[in-house]
């Protein structure tokens, strides 16, 4: 059996070498001479020759200083043979443990660690973690037991100890209130990692802490009073530019300004934000009316896109806006006026008064009226009063100028401002009908064939409106009934059928036809009838001398 005590060897030993470690023995040496040898890593395999054994005595020796951080344990096999070379023992595993010396200082995983913390962070807020490693034995010794400390803080403001580091974990936290990005946007800490729980070897690294922005600064008007002016009636006109400063990080929601007009119930103004410089651009949202209000005193508040993180006072500015008077066109009231008037309204009489208001009530201007469009030349206007009269007879049946019984005239009102301004009003004359048109036949020229003549339909036309139209009454006069007959073609008596009583000679005839409307307004019209040399339905034939009263008169 083997006798091998536990073997350990400190790293980094001084010489002289070789140096005895232990003596290996086999109890078979009582029976005869035993010879010893070793194999394995550090003996006959790389690193070869670190360990040797005296063949006859069994002394195991180390030949050079060991490095635990390179090889912490060697596994060898011991062999025992008799003088004839036969094995007297089975090979035995030998474990050589290299014991640690504190020969490695801690190493930070980075030279510079970067972290961030929001300004205003409360004590206890975790910021970042630094990490160091140590190659020494951290199981059986304190040689790799790292303790972290902060050696320095730059700047040392507002307190020299703004941060603390957990000795064991390397977690850096806020320890003091007062972090303010706008005062101190970054801190540089020199941190140390030392082994032997802080008493041994040490190294340093840098931790750079960026203080990130929160909305802890309000936008502030500078200046807080503004003046501007704008012409009346103009929308989207820039009145003035409002200036603000905000100490928070530029081009972030905590910096971007939002403007609110506190006293603009009518929505007459709007403030937009210039994204480049954060200015407020005050404009008119709609046209202002000088006559209604000459000056506006606006109170404008400014906040940020995101809410304030802390309780802050909202900055306000006062903007005095002067509205400038502009000469405005007179305004007809209403813009379009409908007046009902009979078409037989007396010439020279006043139909209506159509007047305009002068919006520029402070200018005391005079309005002058004139007719701008009166296509039939029926109207005249009093230039001072706007009273409109007829200068000629109205005619509802003047279909060139009257559409759907409506005659449209345009009236203009001009003030004496500088420059002059002109407003337009539309006058609609709704012409009521009078019975001033008698019925007329259509057509007035008629053709018959000499043989087997076809009866002809004559329509009765009246330009008036009901009840001054149908049913019509038709009657042949001046002896025309001797040769011709008429009868009504429809129940409304709006057309008649004319036919000859007897065979007629070829030639031209004149027939007098009296037509009367429903209100007994009548008119005699002469029909021109041609009898042609044809049969049935007549086309157009040559003209001959007319025949009076339906009787032929020789040429």
């Amino acid at each position: 059996d083997w006798v091998i005590p536990p073997i350990s060897c400190p790293e980094n030993e001084k010489g002289p070498f070789p140096k005895n470690l232990v003596q290996i023995k086999s109890n078979k040496d009582k029976e005869g001479k035993v010879f010893y040898s070793i194999t394995g890593q550090g003996a006959d395999t790389p690193p070869v020759g670190v360990f040797i054994i005296e063949r006859e005595t069994g002394w195991l020796k180390v030949t050079e200083p060991l490095d635990r951080e390179r090889i912490a344990t060697y596994t060898l096999f011991s062999h025992a043979v008799s003088s004839n070379g036969n094995a007297v023992e089975d090979p035995m595993e030998i474990l050589i443990t290299v014991t640690d010396q504190n020969d490695n200082k801690p190493e930070f995983t980075q030279e510079v660690f970067k972290g961030s913390v929001m300004e205003g962070a409360l004590p206890g807020t975790s910021v970042m973690e630094v990490t160091a490693t140590d190659a020494d034995d951290d199981v059986n010794t304190y040689n790799a037991a790292i303790a972290y400390t902060i050696l320095s803080q730059d700047p040392e403001l507002p307190d020299k100890n703004m941060f603390t580091i957990n000795r064991n974990t390397g977690v850096i936290s806020v320890v003091t209130t007062g972090l303010d990005r706008e005062s101190f946007p970054t801190y540089t800490l020199v941190v140390q990692a030392a082994d032997l729980q802080g008493e041994g070897l040490s190294t340093t690294a840098t931790a750079v802490i960026t203080v990130t922005d929160t909305n802890d600064n309000p936008p502030i008007f500078n200046p807080t009073t503004y003046k501007g002016q704008v012409p009346e009636n103009e929308a989207n006109v820039v009145i003035t530019t409002l200036k603000v400063t905000d100490a928070d990080a530029p081009n972030t929601p905590a910096w971007e300004a939002v403007y609110t007009i506190l006293n603009d119930d009518g929505g007459q103004f709007v403030v937009t934000t210039n994204p480049v410089n954060n200015d407020g651009i005050l404009k008119t949202a709609k046209g202002l009316d000088f006559e209604a209000k000459q000056q506006y005193i606006l109170h404008v508040a400014v906040t940020n896109v995101v809410p304030f993180e802390v309780s802050l006072t909202t900055s306000t500015a006062t903007v005095t806006v002067d509205v400038l008077d502009v000469n405005e066109a007179p305004i007809f009231v209403p813009p379009e006026k409908r007046v009902e008037v009979s078409e037989d309204f007396g010439v020279g009489q006043e139909i209506t008064s159509y007047t305009a208001q002068e919006p520029d009530t402070f200018m005391e201007q005079k309005i002058t009226y004139r007719i701008w469009r009166d296509t039939a030349n029926w109207l005249e206007i009093n230039p001072d009063t706007g009273a409109i009269s007829t200068r000629a007879e109205l005619d509802r049946e003047d279909f060139e100028h009257v559409k759907n019984s409506t005659y449209t005239a345009l009236i203009i009102a001009t003030d004496n401002g500088s420059p002059v301004a002109t407003g337009t009003g539309t006058l609609l004359l709704i012409l009521s009908d009078v019975n001033d048109n008698a019925p007329i036949p259509e057509p007035r020229t008629i053709f018959f064939c000499e043989r087997n003549p076809k009866p002809q339909v004559i329509n009765i036309i009246d330009a008036d409106l009901p009840p001054n139209t149908s049913p019509f009454t038709a009657e042949l006069t001046h002896g025309a009934s001797a040769n011709w007959t008429i009868q009504y073609n429809d129940p409304t008596q709006e057309s008649i059928i004319l036919k000859p009583k007897m065979a007629l000679e070829v030639g031209d005839y004149k027939i007098n036809l009296k037509l009367m409307d429903n209100q007994n307004k009548d008119q005699v019209t002469t029909l021109e009838v041609s009898v042609c040399d044809c049969e049935g339905a007549a086309g157009v034939c040559r003209k001959a001398q007319p025949v009076e009263a339906g009787l032929q008169i020789p040429a």
């Epitope: 009316d289 006559e291 066109a329 813009p335 409908r338 208001q357 002068e358 919006p359 609609l428």
Partner: antibody, heavy 123, light 113 residues
């Protein structure tokens, strides 16, 4: 404050006449126009006519022959007379003030309405 | 006469939702001399007289909540209630004062879901 109050007969027999008085307060009839508007039960609004501050009158042409509007500025009263009433004249009759200030701004929208007087045409 | 047409005749909206109604005129209500649209909107609650909400097509009458917005020009107009409240239950009428005789739309009845 501005107020308009109509007073009328309530019930009118067919073919008879209607007279309504509108008494106003809080503004001058010499400066403001007053409209008459009616609303049949469950129906829309119909403009009847108006009398201007200066006294001129405009009527709805469809009713012109039956309507008469007048006023007494000193008594702050506006009068509506309508003759030949039929059942389809049954309605709530309102007198209404027209906006009018600073020249034209505010125009002629109707900013104050009376509570109306109910008129029923029935025998 | 100018004919005013409103649509829809009835509109049902949940409280907090947006309600929009339309009004069309048979001719333009835009007056060239002052560039104003002669259109008003009225609210008539049950058993009450009409109340002016909007004039000049988009100007809110004093005291009218800013959830009521009028828009449009020429012949096409609309009234929008941005966030309907139960108290907005009413009939809404548009009205033209551009031309006499002045005329009204038939009304849009706003009902609350």
């Amino acid at each position: 404050q501005v107020q308009l109050k109509e007073s009328g007969p309530g019930l009118v027999a067919p073919s008879q006449s209607l007279s309504i008085t509108c008494t106003v307060s809080g503004f001058s009839l010499s400066r403001y126009s007053v409209h008459w508007v009616r609303q049949p039960p469950g129906k829309g609004l119909e403009w009847l006519g108006m009398i201007w501050g200066g006294g001129s009158i405009d009527y709805n042409s469809g009713l012109k022959s039956r309507l008469s509007i007048s006023k007494d500025n000193s008594k702050s009263q506006v009068f509506l007379k309508m003759n030949s009433l039929q059942s389809d004249d049954t309605a709530m009759y309102h007198c209404v003030r027209a906006q009018f200030y600073y020249g034209y701004d505010g125009g002629y929208a109707m900013d104050y309405w009376g509570q109306g007087t109910s008129v029923t045409v029935s025998s | 006469d100018i004919v005013m047409s409103q649509s829809p005749s009835s509109l049902t909206v949940s409280v907090g939702e947006k309600g929009t109604m339309s009004c069309k005129s048979s001719q333009s209500l835009l007056y060239s001399s002052n560039q104003k649209n002669y259109l008003a909107w009225y609210q008539q609650k049950p058993g009450q007289s009409p109340k002016l909400l909007i004039y000049w097509a988009s100007t809110r009458e004093s005291g009218v909540p800013d959830r009521f917005t009028g828009s449009g020009s020429g012949t096409d107009f609309s009234l929008t209630i941005s966030s309907v409240l139960a108290e907005d239950l009413a009939v809404y009428f548009c009205h033209q004062y551009y031309s006499s005789p002045y005329t009204f739309g038939g009304g849009t009845k706003l009902e609350i879901k």
